[in-house]
């Protein structure tokens, strides 16, 4: 199962902080960075870093503590950029994360200083059983407003 999240400030659920996706083991979380055709918005493109954080970091939208791990950077607003996180109990990669069934994980984005972006937040709730490959509904859309 692949869960697509269009990560941009036109996505009201990310902006409000009430976006929650439920994932099973072996699912994928696909984060789609903001993408602009042509010159982009007048206030400038959104660029930011995405972090996995703890609950206090999620609440305050801060990514500076020892439990705030930088996962990806959306810094190419005129390219098509997507990142994927595999929800797995054990990871073979040193930079991968291990996800436990029944736990909730928190992602936030912190705008880069020159960006027009805002704080965006997502909760990932990991369910119990492993799933076969299929598609799921996306959170937001490329140009959701």
């Amino acid at each position: 199962l692949r869960h697509v999240v269009y990560w941009n400030s036109s996505n009201p659920r990310l902006l409000r902080g009430d976006a929650v996706v439920e994932l099973g083991l072996n699912d994928y979380l696909d984060i789609v960075c903001p993408h602009y055709e042509g010159p982009g918005p007048p206030e400038g493109p959104e660029t930011f870093a995405l972090y996995m954080v703890d609950w206090p970091g999620y609440e305050s939208c801060q990514a500076e503590g020892p439990r705030a791990y930088k996962r990806w950077v959306c810094s190419l607003p005129f390219g098509h950029v997507q990142f994927s996180e595999k929800i797995q109990r054990f990871t073979p990669f040193s930079l991968g994360f291990e996800f436990l069934p029944g736990e909730t994980y928190y992602y936030i984005s912190v705008p880069t200083p020159e960006s027009s972006g805002q704080c965006l937040r997502l909760q990932v709730s990991v369910c119990c059983k492993e799933r076969k490959s299929e598609s799921a509904h996306p959170v937001g859309s490329p140009g959701e407003s």
Epitope: P66, A68, K70
Partner: antibody
Framework: QVQLVQSGAEVKKPGASVKVSCKAS????????IHWVRQAPGQGLEWMGW????????KYNERFKGRVTMTTDTSTSTAYMELRSLRSDDTAVYYC?????????????WGQGTSVTVSS | DIVMTQTPLSLSVTPGQPASISCRSS???????????LYWYLQKPGQSPQLLIY???NRFSGVPDRFSGSGSGTDFTLKISRVEAEDVGVYYC?????????FGGGTKVEIK
């Protein structure tokens, strides 16, 4: 003012369990991590793990995994650390400590310590 | 696990003289978020540890300005510009960048 008051000294036999308490006051208990650190006689400090009372999340030092359980009772603002299958080398002073948030992310207040002696 | 190596093991200092303690980590302590979670604690005889320096170089509230921290990557230093009698005890460096969080072995400071 912030205070962490720990339970009294314990003497245990090998194979037994011990449960040390740490009562917090002077701050919002659910908003700060609690850590447990131990110190064997004449030795240095060893980090055992943390618990976040706001959602009961824990992280344990792998060295203690399977033997340690950290819990909290938010109604009494008390943190607990239980260590099972005690061995003689678990003889130590056990400290609880509060971790402050931004910008410190440091253990800023510590309990007075609880002496645990494991002896047959 | 990250190994934190402190030198020297012990230090005997004349009051008013400077002292320096080194701490070296087996891996860089720069976190993926760009911060460095390196701390210094002092444990006075018969007491619980107390925080001196947080995140490499920031003095905790109430800590005298004769204490200073510096360093980056894997090499860190605690300096006491003028040692006083109340500074005796064991000094520990501590890292919270990599789990498990680990302490150095300690440096015992005594007064000559």
């Amino acid at each position: 003012q912030v205070q962490l008051v720990q339970s009294g000294a314990e003497v245990k036999k090998p194979g037994a369990s011990v449960k040390v308490s740490c009562k917090a006051s002077g701050y919002t208990f659910t908003g700060y991590y609690i850590h447990w650190v131990r110190q064997a006689p004449g030795q240095g400090l060893e980090w055992m793990g943390w618990i976040y009372p706001g959602n009961f999340n824990t992280k344990y030092n792998e060295r203690f995994k399977g033997r340690v359980t950290m819990t909290t009772d938010t109604s009494t603002s008390t943190a607990y650390m239980e260590l099972r299958s005690l061995r003689s080398d678990d003889t130590a002073v056990y400290y609880c400590a509060r971790e402050d948030g931004s910008p410190y992310y440091a253990m800023d207040y510590w309990g007075q310590g609880t002496s645990v002696t494991v002896s047959s | 696990d990250i190994v934190m190596t402190q030198t020297p093991l012990s230090l005997s200092v004349t009051p008013g003289q400077p002292a320096s303690i080194s701490c070296r980590s087996s891996q860089s302590l720069v976190h993926s978020n760009g911060n460095t979670f390196l701390y210094w604690y002092l444990q006075k005889p018969g007491q619980s540890p107390q925080l001196l320096i947080y995140r490499v170089s920031n003095r905790f509230s109430g800590v005298p300005d004769r204490f200073s921290g510096s360093g980056s990557g894997t090499d860190f230093t605690l300096k006491i510009s003028r040692v006083e009698a109340e500074d005796v005890g064991v000094y520990y460096c501590f890292q919270a960048t990599h789990v498990p969080w680990t302490f150095g072995g300690g440096t015992k400071v005594e007064i000559k």
